[in-house]
């Protein structure tokens, strides 16, 4: 059962797993949710009736019955983890805590103009978990405007105290806002020889990498596969760190694999849930339950629905036994990983899928592409919106993409002659323009933010943001697309699609059904050759077939050039301009979104 509300002046008795410090009950609930075993918590707020050393304590708790006795206690706030809930969960915490000093290891001290600058510094520092900033009103002159970057073993403060004229907050890496480089490759036959901060058992290097990603101290990892010569180390996942944030050295070793935490990758690949099945593999751990199940898929469902289950092993039925049902062993451990992994016993193992909802909304799996054909199906491009103008009459004006729950990214040239945001309507979850009737719900536009260097599409900066009057509730038919990370500038995208309701040829009309076309990217050098009269800058990206035939056209403007990379869709381009439509040797020119990520973040995060 999902219980989201907090219980004031209430303490849960017993079931303690560990105590951490958090600046608020709300954040205590998030920490509990991400902890492998925590189901309930009790937070102690600051209060004259409480011992100050107990202020801000967050006691994480577990219970076999999923609940604990309640006791009245002033200043105690209790609640349940969101593990029991089906809604999207995020570790992202943008809150700034006034007059709180979050204690940790102060490893970097520098002057910053504002708390926001200090938070950005923390977000872009590989080791930083949280920060404390002394404001210009801070009593001690030499400490004013000092930004202290901090880290701890757990990622949460070791203590929190009241301190006037300081503010504290957390790194926004988990908000996918870091500009740190992101290394996604896994390096075979490689051991990174740096400090181990922890070790867990994992069935493969990908799971090891995902565990590293959401471990607060892990920056890179080494995994010993099941063929590793030393039996006691097989399936061992070593979580590592170093002062520089990168491995100081690497050792070549057969049957070992190494890689990096994806904490700075704007979560552009799912990092929490391990959805694969591991055949002929048994996961050992504390047994929660043994139930009969028809298949390993059914066993995984049972594990996902049992809130305390972390992983499982399914042993298929012996012929004609138990109505063809096998045994499903639901298991757990202190850290969420198997205590041992055995091979060759015939079991099929896997993990709970309840952690999948902890991934960034933009990484959520959407309907598979329909291969062939040009008409889209419902839910195929859930970030695509149709932007309508109501003046002089209502019509489709441009495409756009949902990039946040209040933000649409589109092209600046769409707003030529648009005097006011009041005449604009954004429709999401639309497949056919004919669905839009007088009573169809839409999002009003609060503000149009056009790049201040924009003059005309052909000279670049053809980018604009629409701030919506109300927030978008994410569903299967309307959800955001991931922005590319600045660390991904080197990615070569091979699966790119342009979508829109635009013309299918130069002299045509707006299409009723959302159209799609798979289009290859073209290098800027090649593109420049095709447009000798224009300057193709690095802030533009081109796509098209040399022979023409498929392209964006009038009415597609502002819509997405969506590219799939590592199973996740990225907004690589915004439809901008081109010579005619689908002409031979005239690729379409798109705004290169990765070059505007800073601008987008600056505008969307402005208070």
């Amino acid at each position: 059962e999902c219980v989201t509300q907090l219980l004031k002046d209430t303490c849960f008795e017993g079931g303690d797993i560990t105590t951490v410090f958090t600046p608020s009950a709300k954040y205590c609930q998030v920490v509990c949710t991400y902890h492998p075993r925590c189901l309930l918590f009790t937070f102690t707020a600051e209060s004259p009736s409480e011992d100050p050393t107990r202020w801000f304590t967050c006691v994480l708790k577990d219970s076999v019955t999923e609940t604990l006795p309640r006791v009245n206690r002033t200043a105690a706030i209790s609640g349940y983890s969101f593990k029991q809930c089906s809604h999207q969960i995020s570790a992202c915490n943008k809150d700034i805590y006034v007059d709180l000093d979050m204690k940790g290891i102060n490893y970097n001290s520098s002057v910053a103009k504002s708390a926001q600058e200090c938070q950005e510094r923390c977000t872009d520092d590989v080791h930083c978990h949280f920060f404390t900033y002394a404001t210009r009103q801070f009593p001690s002159l030499e400490h004013r405007n000092i930004c202290l970057l901090k880290h701890t073993q757990t990622g949460t403060p070791t203590r929190i105290t009241k301190l006037d004229k300081v503010v504290s907050g957390f790194s926004l890496k988990s908000c996918a806002l870091s500009n740190l480089a992101c290394i996604r490759d896994i390096f075979p036959n490689t051991v990174f020889a740096d400090s181990n901060i922890d070790s867990v058992m994992a069935p493969d290097a990908f799971v090891c990498g995902r565990i590293c990603t959401h471990h607060p101290g892990c920056l890179f990892f080494t995994f010993f596969s099941q063929e590793w010569p030393k039996e006691s180390q097989r399936n061992l996942c070593l979580l590592k760190t170093s002062e520089s944030g990168l491995p100081s050295t690497r050792i070549k070793k057969s049957k070992a694999l190494s890689g990096f935490s994806l904490q700075s990758c704007r979560h552009s690949i799912p990092v929490f849930c391990h959805s694969s099945f591991y055949h002929d593999t048994d996961f050992l751990g504390e047994e929660l339950d043994i139930v009969a199940a028809k298949s390993h898929e059914a066993c995984q469902k049972l594990c996902t629905n049992a809130v305390r289950c972390q992983f499982f092993t399914y042993t298929p039925a012996q012929a004609s036994c138990n109505e063809g049902k096998g045994k499903c062993y639901l298991k757990l451990s202190s850290n969420g990983s198997p205590t041992k992994i055995l091979h060759g016993r015939g079991g099929i193992s896997g993990y709970t899928l309840r952690l999948c909802k902890m991934d960034n909304e933009c990484t959520t799996k959407i309907k598979p592409r329909i291969v062939g054909g040009t008409a889209s199906v419902r839910g195929e491009w859930p970030w695509q919106v149709t932007l309508h103008t109501t003046s002089p009459t209502q019509r489709h004006l441009c495409g756009g993409s949902i990039i946040g729950n209040q933000w649409i990214l589109t092209a600046a040239h769409c707003f030529y002659g648009v005097e006011s945001p009041k005449i604009l309507r954004v429709y999401s979850g639309i497949l056919n323009q004919s669905e839009i009737k007088e009573d169809t719900s839409f999002f009003g536009v609060q503000e149009i933010i056009i790049h201040d260097q924009y003059k005309m599409a052909e000279s670049g900066y053809d980018i604009a943001l629409l701030k919506l009057e109300t927030t978008v509730n994410y569903t299967d038919s309307q959800r955001p697309i991931c922005l590319p990370s600045k660390g991904d500038r080197n990615v070569i995208y091979t699966d790119c699609w342009v979508t829109g309701w635009g013309y299918r040829k130069l002299r045509d009309k707006i299409q009723n059904t959302l159209q799609k076309a798979k289009i290859p990217l073209v290098t800027n050098e090649e593109c420049q050759k095709r447009y000798r009269g224009h300057k193709i800058t690095h802030k533009m990206i081109c796509a098209g077939y040399r022979e023409g035939g498929k392209d964006a056209c009038k009415g597609d403007s502002g819509g997405p050039l969506s590219c799939k990379h590592n199973e996740v869709w990225h907004l690589v381009g915004i439809t901008s301009w081109g010579e005619g439509c689908a002409q031979r040797e005239r690729p379409g020119v798109y705004t290169n979104v990765v070059e505007y990520v800073d601008w987008i973040l600056e505008k969307t995060q402005a208070v």
């Epitope: 480089a181 290394i183 996604r184 490759d185 896994i186 390096f187 075979p188 036959n189 490689t190 020889a193 990168l246 491995p247 050295t249 690497r250 050792i251 070549k252 070793k253 057969s254 080197n490 070569i492």
Partner: antibody, heavy 125, light 107 residues
Framework: EVQLQESGPGLVKPSQTLSLTCTVS??????????WSWIRQHPGKGLEWIGS???????YYNPSLKSRVTISVDTSKNQFSLKLSSVTAADTAVYYC?????????????????WGQGTTVTVSS | DIQMTQSPSSVSASVGDRVTITCRAS??????LAWYQQKPGKAPKLLIY???SLQSGVPSRFSGSGSGTDFTLTISSLQPEDFATYYC?????????FGGGTKVEIK
């Protein structure tokens, strides 16, 4: 067939920064299967590894040169570069770029299988 | 750093001779060793990788053996084009290091 070509000034003044670029043709630098390396050879002497870079930007340097070396990669130009600061006469050498195979298929095919022809750099005032 | 010691530093041999060059690592490197051939004014050329695997296009008269700390490059029947300097290289651990080289000269 992949080919590498070093380019950069042949003469550098002491205390200045030596800058060389290696252009990769006939194949993409964008591959997890390779590191891209710089090696030098002092006149009449053996080979000295300077450092390597992966397309992702992951670098390894020779500790004896680490404080002075920066290797970078530009996947859009299919190039990688070497910068060696505060040079002295002891940095006079033939500088080679090479492809270091680190095969992602894990079949243990390793070694520097493609080399540039080398460029002579003299440090002198 | 792992030191790679090659011996001999030079060897005089005739066409048709069998030539053996040894390379010793200051610590175990499993089989992470390569052999290169370098001719004057030219870049090195990869002959052997993983201690004993022949690089494609390299004549079969070249062979490598060894594991751990002791390695050998053998040219079974020396040809005129084989007169050059040979280097071993370990890539077990960064920094990558090369042996001092063995010059194979005409007798």
């Amino acid at each position: 067939e992949v080919q590498l070509q070093e380019s950069g000034p042949g003469l550098v003044k002491p205390s200045q920064t030596l800058s060389l670029t290696c252009t990769v043709s006939g194949g993409s630098i964008y591959s997890g299967a390779y590191y891209w390396s710089w090696i030098r050879q002092h006149p009449g002497k053996g080979l000295e590894w300077i450092g390597s870079i992966h397309y992702s930007g992951l670098t390894y340097y020779n500790p004896s040169l680490k404080s002075r070396v920066t290797i970078s990669v530009d996947t859009s130009k299919n190039q990688f570069s070497l910068k060696l600061s505060s040079v002295t006469a002891a940095d006079t050498a033939v500088y080679y770029c090479a492809r270091d195979v680190d095969d992602s298929s894990g079949d243990e095919h390793y070694g520097m299988d493609v080399w540039g022809q080398g460029t002579t750099v003299t440090v002198s005032s | 750093d792992i030191q790679m010691t090659q011996s001999p530093s030079s060897v005089s041999a005739s066409v048709g001779d069998r030539v053996t060059i040894t390379c010793r690592a200051s610590q175990g490197i499993d089989s992470w060793l390569a052999w290169y051939q370098q001719k004057p004014g030219k870049a090195p050329k990869l002959l052997i990788y993983a201690a004993s695997s022949l690089q494609s296009g390299v004549p079969s008269r070249f062979s490598g053996s060894g594991s751990g700390t002791d390695f050998t490059l053998t040219i079974s029947s020396l040809q005129p084009e084989d007169f050059a300097t040979y280097y071993c290289q370990q890539y077990h651990i960064v920094p990558i290091t090369f042996g001092g080289g063995t010059k194979v000269e005409i007798k």
